[in-house]
């Protein structure tokens, strides 16, 4: 996602309030959580910590030579973590889901 | 990667010449190939064809409410394909690698 061009691709905090996104209608708890976000640029040379694919390396090299032909690789979540949520099931019974997958960034990389 | 905001996230052609990126020193053939690129925006609501993760959906909703707080999800390769390359091994023998992985975009998505 977007980020200051001065910083390289990294994971930063992103507090999300379920009421803000309209999910409070079914998620009882938590009221908010840290989704994190991937922020920053994918600059040449791509560092090992952004685990670039070969395609990302190629795209970065093409961008370096022809900046108007193709954009840089993008800083995105490459590994996600679950969170635990309390929600109402279809019977209206409050139910705990320990692993609601893919809700929080674990790792960022250049893709 | 970057793309016209008017079009949604999709795979488009990106011809890459190995000489342009300095890889002609070790890749003998092909001289060029289609790496493809992922281009376009990840707009609300995220369509099924961009296979959004839950995090991408959350980020899109937060961006919708607070556009300055967080950027949109990014259109990136979600599946890569190999290409075949001819290169010189350490004995100087031209060698065919049938599956040089991760070189070409197979699918794009919003992450």
């Amino acid at each position: 996602s977007t980020g200051a061009a001065s910083s390289h691709c990294q994971k930063t905090s992103l507090r999300v309030n379920f009421e803000d996104i309209g999910w409070d209608s079914w998620i009882i708890a938590p009221k908010e959580y840290d989704a994190y976000e991937c922020k920053g640029g994918c600059f040449f040379p791509l560092a090992d910590d952004v685990t670039p694919t070969k395609h990302a390396i190629v795209q970065t090299l093409v961008h370096l030579k022809f900046p108007t032909k193709v954009g840089k690789a993008c800083c995105v979540p490459t590994k996600l973590s679950p969170i635990s949520i309390l929600y109402k099931d279809d019977m209206g019974v409050p139910t705990l889901k320990y692993h609601y997958e893919g809700m929080s960034v674990a790792e960022c990389g250049c893709r | 990667s970057t793309g016209a905001a008017s079009s949604h996230c999709q795979k488009t052609s990106l011809r890459v010449n190995f000489e342009d990126i300095g890889w002609d020193s070790w890749i003998i053939a092909p001289k060029e190939y289609d790496a493809y690129e992922c281009k376009g925006g990840c707009f609300f609501p995220l369509a099924d064809d961009v296979t959004p993760t839950k995090h991408a959906i959350v980020q899109t909703l937060v961006h919708l409410k607070f556009p300055t707080k967080v950027g949109k999800a990014c259109c990136v390769p979600t599946k890569l394909s190999p290409i075949s390359i001819l290169y010189k091994d350490d004995m100087g023998v031209p060698t065919l690698k049938y599956h040089y992985e991760g070189m070409s975009v197979a699918e794009c998505g919003c992450r």
């Epitope: - | 003998i28 053939a29 092909p30 001289k31 060029e32 190939y33 290409i83 075949s84 001819l86 004995m91 023998v93 031209p94 060698t95 065919l96 049938y98």
Partner: antibody, heavy 118, light 111 residues
Framework: QVQLVQSGAEVKKPGASVKVSCKAS????????MHWVRQAPGQGLEWMGE????????NYNEKFKSRVTMTVDKSISTAYMELSRLRSDDTAVYYC???????????WGQGTLVTVSS | EIVLTQSPATLSLSPGERATLSCRAS??????????MNWFQQKPGQAPRFLIY???NQGSGIPARFSGSGSGTDFTLTISSLQPEDTAVYFC?????????FGGGTKVEIK
């Protein structure tokens, strides 16, 4: 450096068999396919087949399939080509050659002349 | 099997002249963006020498005056400035499929 040294010239009678050897040095023997190519006097090149020294797998030219056997002895880095039921038109120079995995013949032996005559 | 037809059968030129040798395949030799065409030089009483591979790449130690071009079914070996030591028979070979096949050869003579 890479070297392929072949066995000496042979004279055989029609119906007999011949076994030509090719001793390899200067590289890891099991790394590349070994090809056999023959050339009749004043004629062009004819591919006979190839063997993978690592597993012993072979690909033969259909023309020779019933008469040719390619083998290797990894312990002495040597490839062999045996041709049976010889005819006078088998008179040729037989070459071994190291093949890249895409089929190009990169290094060649010096050749072995096999003469079939009654 | 793939049939390779070389022309002319004999080429007689003066030193310094440009030699153009042709090889036509009965079907395309292209696969994976690679042309599976090789050229060999054979001098009298000697084993063939690996000259050009993958249509346009020089083998180790081959003088720059030798170049290859072409794709699909039509290939050319060019000797830019003939030298007396270039007197030889030149064979094309396809390595796309088994059986590997050779052309009938072109004999190059120096006047």
């Amino acid at each position: 450096q890479v070297q392929l040294v072949q066995s000496g010239a042979e004279v055989k009678k029609p119906g007999a068999s011949v076994k030509v050897s090719c001793k390899a040095s200067g590289y890891t023997f099991t790394r590349y396919w070994m090809h056999w190519v023959r050339q009749a006097p004043g004629q062009g090149l004819e591919w006979m087949g190839e063997i993978n020294p690592s597993q012993g797998g072979t690909n033969y030219n259909e023309k020779f399939k019933s008469r040719v056997t390619m083998t290797v002895d990894k312990s002495i880095s040597t490839a062999y080509m045996e041709l049976s039921r010889l005819r006078s038109d088998d008179t040729a120079v037989y070459y071994c050659a190291i093949g890249a995995n895409y089929g190009g013949l990169v290094y060649w032996g010096q050749g072995t002349l096999v003469t079939v005559s009654s | 099997e793939i049939v390779l037809t070389q022309s002319p059968a004999t080429l007689s030129l003066s030193p310094g002249e440009r030699a153009t040798l042709s090889c036509r395949a009965s079907e395309s030799l292209d696969n994976y963006g690679i042309s599976f065409m090789n050229w060999f030089q054979q001098k009298p009483g000697q084993a063939p020498r690996f000259l050009i591979y993958a249509a346009s790449n020089q083998g180790s130690g081959i003088p720059a005056r030798f170049s290859g071009s072409g794709s699909g079914t039509d290939f050319t070996l060019t000797i830019s400035s003939l030298q007396p030591e270039d007197t030889a028979v030149y064979f094309c070979q396809q390595s796309k499929e088994v059986p590997r096949t050779f052309g009938g050869g072109t004999k190059v003579e120096i006047k």
